[in-house]
Interface confidence: low
Amino acid sequence: VLPTKPENISCVFYFDRNLTCTWRPEKETNDTSYIVTLTYSYGKSNYSDNATEASYSFPRSCAMPPDICSVEVQAQNGDGKVKSDITYWHLISIAKTEPPIILSVNPICNRMFQIQWKPREKTRGFPLVCMLRFRTVNSSHWTEVNFENCKQVCNLTGLQAFTEYVLALRFRFNDSRYWSKWSKEETRVTMEEVPHVLDLWRILEPADMNGDRKVRLLWKKARGAPVLEKTFGYHIQYFAENSTNLTEINNITTQQYELLLMSQAHSVSVTSFNSLGKSQEAILRIPDVHEKTFQYIKSMKAYIAEPLLVVNWQSSIPAVDTWIVEWLPEAAMSKFPALSWESVSQVTNWTIEQDKLKPFTCYNISVYPVLGHRVGEPYSIQAYAKEGTPLKGPETRVENIGLRTATITWKEIPKSARNGFINNYTVFYQAEGGKELSKTVNSHALQCDLESLTRRTSYTVWVMASTRAGGTNGVRINFKTLS
């Protein structure tokens, strides 16, 4: 039987190394050998050799770009010979190079890196295309940037200041379909700048009899600020709106400060500074004690979307694009230092990982609209990041025992023992030697009437309080219907 005609010839030119071609079928059943023929130097020269497998590497001396080569494979066995079709290969279009070497990555002004690199091969002036990929060290998402006709220095711009990046580079010949593998990764930090503007918030204490009140300012690095950003300290400036008197407090090293302000409206600003200068001001207006603030939130809901707690709200005006979300355990004695807060921009939802909140704890969550530097009226709800079954069941009593009726009453479980929102109560009752029956009522009910009981019969009754996580039974009590 004649050998199968060689087909699907595929060649890769490993630059400055060899031209490797493979073909099908990869395995012949009978004893097949091959003669491979390469025509090169634009058809002026030939090279032939024997091959025992469906693959052959032509030596470097036969593959010198720029060239268009042709490859033909002849399969032969004891029964005869079969030639493939002739295939033509533009060497540069199938050239594959080694991963390049990054020689240096230098941070230079204006949030950029200058990358100096070199190929492992001598590319002999053929135009190259490069691709840089980069990510911040704590991210897994790569951004890729193409450099057409790239030289051996690339400038990567549009980065974030004082941020640690991981970079890698690959390249190909302009006309090649094959990229090199990525270079080894390099890690560098962009140059430091003045600090980013801070996120600023406040806790307002009730005013005293004179209208004076304590205002605790809280601030932190904004979400978009570089992770590595260092700050030497903070400056506060504030003034009453009806006055030109400016008060300054310098070189604060904590991220909170308590002011005693008179009853009128004030403007407060906080800046941070480092060796290069100071940040822009973060400004907040503290309203007059008697001022009515605006209400811009229509509704709000909280729900669990594992592994997150999600809070959504509806705004009544689109102009608000910044919101402050506050959350603190309901049992906290005071807002400071138990309060946590976060600034949210351009969205009307907020999420937090459930693990970052205490399980089985009721949180008060408030959202404040911020318009310019003015803070509006908050909308507040309660939520649990994770619910559990109540720590104990309801304390139960039986009242109004009749011939066939009884009223079961119970006390609300103390909040500290609920471990979640009580969804409902289930009253279980069972006549002596009889079947267990039950009635479920909503979470607002604290009593339940049992009817159609059997006269002069002993009953056991207990009440189960349920959260999303499950129920907990109260103590069983016994009663006997009248005769």
Epitope: V12, Y14, E98, I101, S104, K181, K184, R188
Partner: antibody
Framework: QVQLVQSGAEVKKPGASVKVSCKAS????????MHWVRQAPGQGLEWMGW????????NYAQKFQGRVTMTRDTSISTAYMELSRLRSDDTAVYYC??????????????????WGRGTLVTVSS | LPVLTQPPSVSVAPGQTARITCGGN??????VYWYQQEPGQAPVLVVY???DRPAGIPERFSGANSGNTATLTISRVEAGDEADYYC???????????FGGGTKLTVL
């Protein structure tokens, strides 16, 4: 031609430190990683870590974390390996080896194509 | 880190073929390098990228790698091939080098 010349043999007491040097010539020192590999008497090869001579970045084997420090001086094309808190089982020949530029079309990683002749470090009280 | 297992010794008569194995869990998915170390000398890279030879290494040295075993094959063995041979891989998650325990090739 490409070569790596290492410093001479050392005898140290337990608890001391040793610093071995490796001077590169015949190629661009900052272009290729430098690895350190040791071999205890009659034992096999043990990889210790690498340094990127360009950036100074390092990567140490878990076993040597906290005891090994790899540095370089690009002005004299020299890599250094310092091992502290020496113990008798640190007695070994310490090699520096360049990570190669042999074309390896399918590979992201390379072999070590040029080795120093080794530095014998003896730790004995 | 991957663990690479080599036989401690392999013996072969001159002119025969020596096969030195390097076992490791799914080693076929990694790139394997082989080094030859003659007594008192520094190691020499003899195979890189599973199957390729650096310049100056005789064609008698070849490599293969698939599944859980990589193999260094030395055909037409000569007395001068007597040496220790080590396989090596890079652990791609840590970029740490890992060597096999080494195999002493004895030419009978």
């Amino acid at each position: 031609q490409v070569q790596l010349v290492q410093s001479g043999a050392e005898v140290k007491k337990p608890g001391a430190s040793v610093k071995v040097s490796c001077k590169a010539s015949g190629y661009t020192f900052t272009g290729y990683y430098m690895h350190w590999v040791r071999q205890a008497p009659g034992q096999g090869l043990e990889w210790m870590g690498w340094i990127n001579p360009n950036s100074g970045g390092t990567n140490y084997a878990q076993k040597f974390q906290g005891r090994v420090t790899m540095t370089r001086d690009t002005s004299i094309s020299t890599a250094y390996m310092e091992l502290s808190r020496l113990r008798s089982d640190d007695t070994a020949v310490y090699y520096c080896a360049r990570e190669d530029v042999v074309p390896a079309a399918m590979s992201f990683y390379y072999g070590m194509d040029v080795w120093g002749r080794g530095t014998l470090v003896t730790v004995s009280s | 880190l991957p663990v690479l297992t080599q036989p401690p010794s392999v013996s072969v008569a001159p002119g025969q073929t020596a096969r030195i194995t390097c076992g490791g869990n799914n080693i076929g998915s990694k790139t394997v390098y082989w080094y030859q170390q003659e007594p008192g000398q520094a190691p020499v890279l003899v195979v890189y990228d599973d199957t390729d030879r650096p310049a100056g290494i005789p064609e008698r040295f070849s490599g293969a790698n698939s599944g859980n075993t990589a193999t260094l094959t030395i055909s037409r063995v000569e007395a001068g091939d007597e040496a220790d041979y080590y396989c090596q891989v890079w652990d791609s998650s840590t970029d740490h080098g890992v060597f096999g325990g080494g195999t002493k090739l004895t030419v009978l």
